[in-house]
Interface confidence: medium
């Protein structure tokens, strides 16, 4: 017996009880694909989920967030709980940063501010919970000879600026 | 509510094509097969084939060879090609939606019919 | 192609009277079989599909049974709107076939 369902469009599903009759896809399901015999159901964005696409016959429907959380995971497949910048999720809710860590997002782990001494540097801009510090120029480069408006403050290594 | 509407010539010459369209109004044509079926006069009904929205189609194997139908999505309309005719396709044409998935393809929606004669 | 016949072809009866039109297919069809009403002059009306499921809008005098090759529509107590002709079509294979009609007249 010849294969009809490879003629059946996205969209639609082959109908085995019915000598492969092709049909639209059920309310809430679809089918990306030609071909199929079943018609996958449509994703729910319920809860902490939002909808960003609507489900339709030939595609799934997409989720985001709502306000306070942020997609993880393929396709938005989780939804975490924002954190302000300067902290960080743990399993008892968001915490600041540790002293000499930062994080300058909504999301994510804090990380340790960088140490300009490794590269050489100087610490130009002192290191906050939501912010790295920023590396200034070597100690070579601040020579007698170089030209500088004002005197260059002294190096701090990373974890002596205030909180 | 959705209704139907065929439009197309009454009167078609022997060998030439009859052409008929039907458009879609109070819905939307997408997510549905249609079909073309026709009743020649104090006789039965014909299912003549369907067209879904992505416009794969089925033809009855009596008319394939002279049936071409296609779909215009943004005029919400379907169209009914049938060449070469002859006398013996004079008939009232209908166009029906296939009432999608739980009514198993039973017509649901018809349009009121439009008549087709064949004659020099 | 699945060959469907009705009988009776005609029937003649009376306001009130219980009717009922047989169908038969060439070929099982399970329940893939719907019923159609068409007064002269207009087009067909669905009335009863997958063999019972009562359209909606359809008076609940008209029930559907059956499954396989034979199958019923039955109008429990005809009224005057209900003289016309009475089709079955199958959808179980392509193409999609009718049955030949059964007229319901006035006795």
């Known amino acids: 017996l010849q294969d009809l369902c490879s003629n059946c469009p996205a969209g639609t599903f082959c109908d085995n009880n019915r000598s492969q009759i092709c049909s639209p896809c059920p309310p809430n399901s679809f089918s990306s694909a030609g071909g199929q015999r079943t018609c996958d159901i449509c994703r729910q964005c319920k809860g902490v989920f939002k909808t960003r696409k609507e489900c339709s016959s030939t595609s799934n429907a997409e989720c985001d967030c709502i306000s306070g959380y942020h997609c993880l995971g393929a396709e938005c497949s989780m939804c975490e709980q924002d954190c302000k910048q300067g902290q960080e999720l743990t399993k008892k809710g968001c915490k600041d940063c540790c002293f000499g860590t930062f994080n300058d997002q909504k999301r994510g782990i804090c990380r340790p501010w960088t140490n300009c001494s490794l590269d050489g540097k100087s610490v130009l801009v002192n290191g906050t919970k939501e912010r790295d510090v920023v590396c200034g120029p070597s100690p070579a480069d601040l020579s007698p000879g170089a030209s500088s408006a004002t005197p260059p403050a002294p190096a701090r290594e990373p974890g002596h600026s205030p909180q | 509510q959705v209704q139907l509407q065929e439009s197309g010539p009454g009167l078609v010459k022997p060998s030439e094509t009859l052409s008929l369209n039907c458009t879609v109004s109070?819905?939307?044509?997408?997510?549905?097969?249609w079909s073309w079926i026709r009743q020649p006069a104090g006789k039965g009904l014909e299912w003549i084939g369907r067209?879904?929205?992505?416009?794969?189609?089925n033809y009855n194997p009596s008319l394939k060879s002279r049936v071409t139908m296609s779909v215009d999505t943004s005029k919400n309309q379907f169209s009914l090609k049938l060449t070469s005719v002859t006398a013996a396709d004079t008939a009232v044409y209908y166009c029906?939606?296939?009432?999608?998935?739980?009514?198993?393809?039973?017509?649901?929606?018809w349009g009121q019919g439009t008549m087709v004669t064949v004659s020099s | 192609d699945i060959q469907m016949t009705q009988s009776p072809s005609s029937v003649s009866a009376s306001v009130g009277d219980r009717v009922t039109i047989t169908c038969r297919a060439s070929?099982?069809?399970?329940?893939?079989l719907a019923w159609f009403q068409q007064i002269p002059g207009k087009a067909p009306k669905l009335l009863i599909y997958?063999?019972?499921g009562l359209q909606s809008g359809v008076p609940s005098r008209f029930s559907g049974s059956g499954s396989g090759t034979d199958f019923t529509l039955t109008i429990s107590s005809l009224q005057p709107e209900d003289f016309a002709t009475y089709y079955c079509?199958?959808?179980?294979?392509?193409?999609?076939?009718f049955g030949p009609g059964t007229k319901v007249d006035i006795k």
């Open positions: 029906a939606r296939d009432g999608n998935w739980n009514y198993a393809d039973a017509f649901d929606i």
């Open positions: 109070g819905g939307s044509i997408s997510n549905y097969y």
């Open positions: 067209i879904y929205t992505s416009g794969n189609t």
């Open positions: 070929q099982g069809i399970s329940s893939w």
């Open positions: 997958t063999a019972s």
């Open positions: 079509q199958q959808t179980n294979s392509f193409p999609f076939t």
